[in-house]
């Protein structure tokens, strides 16, 4: 087997494993939120992991480019131009996956839990646009509703408090996830910051995919062992 | 706003039970523990403990255990603190406060709840 | 369980004056102190939490500062509904315990 199928099947494992925990990580909220929805308690933790980021984004797409890079591994049918270039072409997919993974994500870590913006964990703060990406800016990426103490006023009314220094709230020992507010501050910012990582990787490794995969149209791949014979 | 509404003043006999209650609106009542706080006249402040009220979890001050039980009623936004066995020394103006961020400092309070042990 | 020792436990001051009250720790509580307000026969109000952020609504007049074991609340230009009795109080650890309280009087 050529560097380049190595390379592929590495690939294809890695992608396997990056899927397994997108796929993983968006349940987690989702999972809390059908728990914890008894008769007077619809408190959803926030509402981009209903956009799927880790299902959808980071998992299905994913799934072409998977199956074609670990097929490589068994030289079967993918073991030849024709794979490694649908390889590649499937990875276009797992890099859109990917990227969308990545933007529902930020926008996540933006804004916080629901309860950090709506006193009643409405879903009013929980559209998705590509304007709110674009109004990014580095100073807006604070995570001030985690790293203070509160995230925001219960009443949603007054400003957050944005005199509370950063990172007051873990500048000591002393931080408790008794309250169901710091249950959904921790839960929300492990799974978001978690699926941007997944986001990152994947990008990272389907990018390398269709840059093998093309180097692989190009110089040939291994011929079969019966061949060889 | 958040607001905590406690019950009236409470006059009671020495051995007696009594239960007082702490009704919370302007915030998402399970979001958040309530803290109960003793003053005893012209004294100080002892903090007697917790409920989670989205799971009933407790948290008490070792001082108060087989004192004081909290409870809570999600449907009506009511916590309640219940003192047994009441004697003189649990004279004193009982508050409810809303606990809040990583610390569960006291962020908002009730306006308290008198109770007089008396014979 | 921690000792919050206060001082004073009392002072008379004049409108418009600066004062600082001061807490301390029987160990260090890495800055999880607040500070609370208690109007007289009204109940509490939190003015100052994690030893150096105000809470909503506080006038810029209060601040706190202090680490380790040692803080201390100070009020620049006295107004007269500042008149009351302060608690410091730590969220270190539990139990949570409070100072033993300054009553603020006018001179």
């Known amino acids: 087997m050529t560097c380049c199928e190595g390379w592929t099947s590495c690939n294809g494992f890695s992608l396997l494993v990056l899927l397994l925990l997108g796929v993983v990580l968006n349940a987690i909220p989702l999972i809390v939120s059908l728990v914890e929805e008894d008769q007077f308690s619809q408190n959803p933790i926030s509402c981009f992991e209903w956009w799927f980021p880790g299902i959808i984004g980071a998992g299905l797409m994913a799934i072409p480019a998977t199956t074609m890079s670990l097929t490589a591994r068994k030289r079967a049918c993918c073991n030849n131009r024709t794979g490694m270039f649908l390889s590649s072409l499937f990875s276009v997919i797992t890099v859109i996956g990917a990227l969308y993974c990545m933007l529902i994500s930020i926008q996540a870590l933006l804004k916080g839990p629901l309860m950090c913006n709506s006193p009643s964990n409405s879903n009013a703060n929980c559209e998705f646009s590509l304007k709110n990406i674009s109004d990014i800016h580095p100073e807006s990426f604070n995570l001030q509703w985690f790293f203070n103490d509160s995230c925001a006023p219960p009443t949603g009314f007054n400003k957050p408090t944005s005199n509370d220094t950063m990172a007051s709230g873990w500048r000591a020992s002393s931080f408790h996830f008794d309250s169901e507010e710091n249950k959904h501050r921790l839960i929300h910012f492990s799974v978001f910051l978690g699926l941007l990582l997944v986001g990152i990787l994947e990008v990272l490794f389907g990018l390398s995919q269709i840059v093998i995969g093309f180097l692989g149209c190009l110089c040939g791949v291994s011929k079969r062992r019966s061949q060889i014979v | 706003e958040v607001q905590l509404q406690q019950s009236g003043p409470e006059l009671v006999k020495p051995g007696a039970s009594v239960k007082m209650s702490c009704k919370a609106s302007?915030?998402?009542?399970?979001?958040?523990?309530m803290h109960w706080v003793k003053q005893k006249p012209g004294q100080g402040l002892e903090w007697i403990g917790y409920?989670?009220?989205?799971?009933?979890?407790?948290k008490y001050n070792e001082k108060f255990k087989g004192k004081a039980t909290l409870t809570s009623d999600k449907s009506s936004s009511t916590a309640y603190m219940e003192l047994s066995s009441l004697t003189s020394e649990d004279s004193a103006v009982y508050y409810c406060?809303?606990?809040?961020?990583?610390?569960?400092?006291?962020?908002?309070w009730g306006q308290g709840t008198l109770v007089t042990v008396s014979a | 369980d921690i000792l919050m020792t206060q001082s004073p436990s009392s002072m008379s001051v004049s409108l418009g004056d600066t004062v600082s009250i001061t807490c301390h720790a029987s160990?260090?509580?890495?800055?999880?102190i607040g500070w609370l307000q208690q109007k007289p026969g009204k109940s509490f109000k939190g003015l100052i939490y994690?030893?150096?952020n105000l809470e909503d609504g506080v006038p810029s007049r209060f601040s706190g500062s202090g680490s380790g074991a040692d803080y201390s609340l100070t009020i620049t230009s006295l107004e007269s509904e500042d008149f009351a009795v302060y608690y410091c109080?730590?969220?270190?650890?539990?139990?949570?315990?409070f100072g033993g309280g300054t009553k603020l009087e006018i001179k």
């Open positions: 302007g915030y998402r009542f399970t979001n958040y523990v």
């Open positions: 406060a809303r606990g809040a961020g990583w610390s569960l400092r006291f962020a908002d």
């Open positions: 109080v730590q969220y270190s650890q539990f139990p949570r315990t």
């Open positions: 994690l030893a150096t």
């Open positions: 160990q260090g509580i890495s800055s999880n």
């Open positions: 409920i989670n009220p989205y799971n009933a979890g407790t």
